[in-house]
Interface confidence: medium
């Protein structure tokens, strides 16, 4: 911009609000006003005036012609197969036609299932509250991503925050432990495995607690890449109810097995 010699502007649709206050002095300071024909279209009080004849104190933002987001879509987690919705609202003091769009991972959703409406809380459209609701039906993993609403009128577009949708599946057991009866000094073997999204973590308890003899005495072994829980050198006080819990961010499930220990 240092070497700018001429700037040609010819427009009668300037939005003469506080964001344009810088332009006239900038043009004059660089002696670029000769080729500029710029008149205000809004607000109504300045309509038809040249931007150079508008006093600096008249460039104010006392209304909001461009929509302003008032309700952001919220990050959410949903179970596979459930219906969810993202809500986005914007306010505007302009009655200029409004359009609505939703983006997923920065791509516009062309066939979005949207519910759009306006609440006229004040007479003469002083402030209109525009709402767009994106409905996602029977979500799958393909719906995961970041969603953003775009609300646009003649004066510009406003973008909401990006809300993340995570799609989860409750854990379900693929293997559950069975009741067993064994003798002391031998090895007890309990199986437990589960699937889910995200992958569930498996945890074991005895009689409702995590502080039990086999754990304290390091006779308990869980194979990291296996579905088997071992107790070596079984003792009488190892007898009890063992619970396998599979947990992820969607929830948790438990399965019990009773270990009976007989004296050798």
């Amino acid at each position: 911009m240092k070497n700018l010699k001429e700037l040609h502007i010819s427009s009668d649709s300037f939005l003469c609000d506080c964001q344009l206050k810088w332009l006239p002095p900038w043009l004059i300071g660089r002696m670029l006003q000769a080729f500029v024909t710029a008149t205000c279209a809004h607000p109504e009080s300045l309509k038809g005036q040249s931007i150079f004849s508008v006093p600096p104190e008249s460039f104010v933002c006392d209304d909001f012609l461009k929509p302003q987001i008032i309700t952001q879509p919220e990050t959410t987690m949903a179970m596979v197969g459930k219906d969810i919705r993202f809500t986005c609202s914007a306010a505007s003091s302009s009655s200029s036609p409004m359009t609505f769009a939703w983006k997923k991972d920065n791509e516009v959703l062309t066939n979005a299932d949207m519910e759009n409406f306006v609440h006229v809380h004040a007479q003469d459209g002083e402030v209109m509250e525009y709402t767009t609701i994106l409905h996602l039906r029977q979500v799958t993993f393909g719906h995961e991503g970041r969603y953003q609403c775009v609300i646009t009128n003649h004066f510009g577009s406003t973008y909401s925050h990006k809300a993340r949708l995570t799609v989860n599946v409750l854990p379900s057991f693929t293997k559950t432990p069975h009741d067993i009866t064994i003798r002391t000094t031998t090895m007890a073997r309990l199986e437990c495995a589960a699937t889910g999204h995200p992958n569930p973590q498996i945890a074991w308890q005895k009689d409702g607690g995590t502080d039990f003899p086999a754990a304290r005495e390091r006779r308990m072994h869980v194979m990291p890449d296996d579905d088997v829980f071992f107790i070596t050198d079984v003792k009488i006080d190892d007898a009890g109810v063992y619970s396998c819990t599979a947990q992820n961010s969607a929830g948790s499930i438990s399965a019990n097995a009773t270990l009976t220990v007989l004296e050798t």
Epitope: R85, P97, E115, F117, V118, V120, H121, A122, I133
Partner: antibody
């Protein structure tokens, strides 16, 4: 003829539940916001709940929040009010009402006004 | 205690003009539009005025609404005996996120 017909009222014990229905006819139900308003006999009107035309937006009066649930089935042209943990002070005539909506240029403008009302259904909460 | 305040009663003779007031705050009447309802004895309410001063079709032009600041009023000119009813003002309250009614005004035609 545009009509709203409430049903489901009756006598229920405190702590009990009741589900009110409002059957709409004579207009495109899915194009309109709907509300429930109640009135203790001989007293004033009290707004209870509001649901947007598509069901995506819902509001409740503080007095019923957490106890009442508004819902709608646009395929059945029916508005519902599920009332749980009922109290003696919930005794009233319950009206369902249609929100005033004017559609133009592909967008519907909803005003804070109710232009069609049902005849009401009486809910009595008493032991 | 209603969020919007109305006089409990008003009266007038046939042909007279009566006015019913409704006082609120900036969170309701001050920034949102006012609606008026008429409730004849033993019937459901009826929409009389919406968006401060608009009449739905079928409502006689004897009924008019106005608003100034945080107050609104309903005027009925050429009072008739069939106007004897309860009148309620209402508005959306932005602070409460709720629709609020006035306590109602019982109009008696003498």
């Amino acid at each position: 003829e545009v009509q709203l017909l409430e049903s489901g009222g009756g006598l229920v014990q405190p702590g009990g539940s009741l589900r009110l229905s409002c059957a709409a006819s004579g207009f495109t139900f899915s194009d309109y916001d709907m509300s429930w308003v109640r009135q203790v006999p001989g007293k004033g009107l009290e707004w209870v709940s509001w649901i947007s035309h598509g069901g995506g937006s819902i509001y409740y009066a503080d007095s019923v929040k957490g106890r009442f649930t508004i819902s709608r089935d646009n395929s059945k042209n029916t508005l519902y009010l599920q009332m749980n943990s009922l109290r003696a002070e919930d005794t009233a005539v319950y009206y369902c009402a249609r929100g005033l909506g004017l559609c133009k240029t592909g967008l519907c403008y909803y005003y804070d006004a109710m232009d069609v009302w049902g005849q009401g259904t009486l809910v009595t909460v008493s032991s | 205690q209603s969020v919007l305040t109305q006089p409990p009663s008003a009266s007038g003779t046939p042909g007279q003009r009566v006015t019913i007031s409704c006082t609120g705050s900036s969170s309701n009447i001050g920034n949102n539009s006012v609606t008026w309802y008429q409730q004849l004895p033993g019937t459901a309410p009826k929409l009389l005025i919406y968006a401060d001063n608009n009449r739905p079709s079928g409502v006689p032009d004897r009924f008019s609404g106005s608003k100034s600041g945080t107050s609104a009023s309903l005027a009925i000119s050429g009072l008739r005996s069939e106007d004897e009813a309860d009148y309620y003002c209402a508005a959306w309250d932005s602070s409460l996120s709720a629709y609020v009614f006035g306590g109602g005004t019982k109009l008696t035609v003498l």
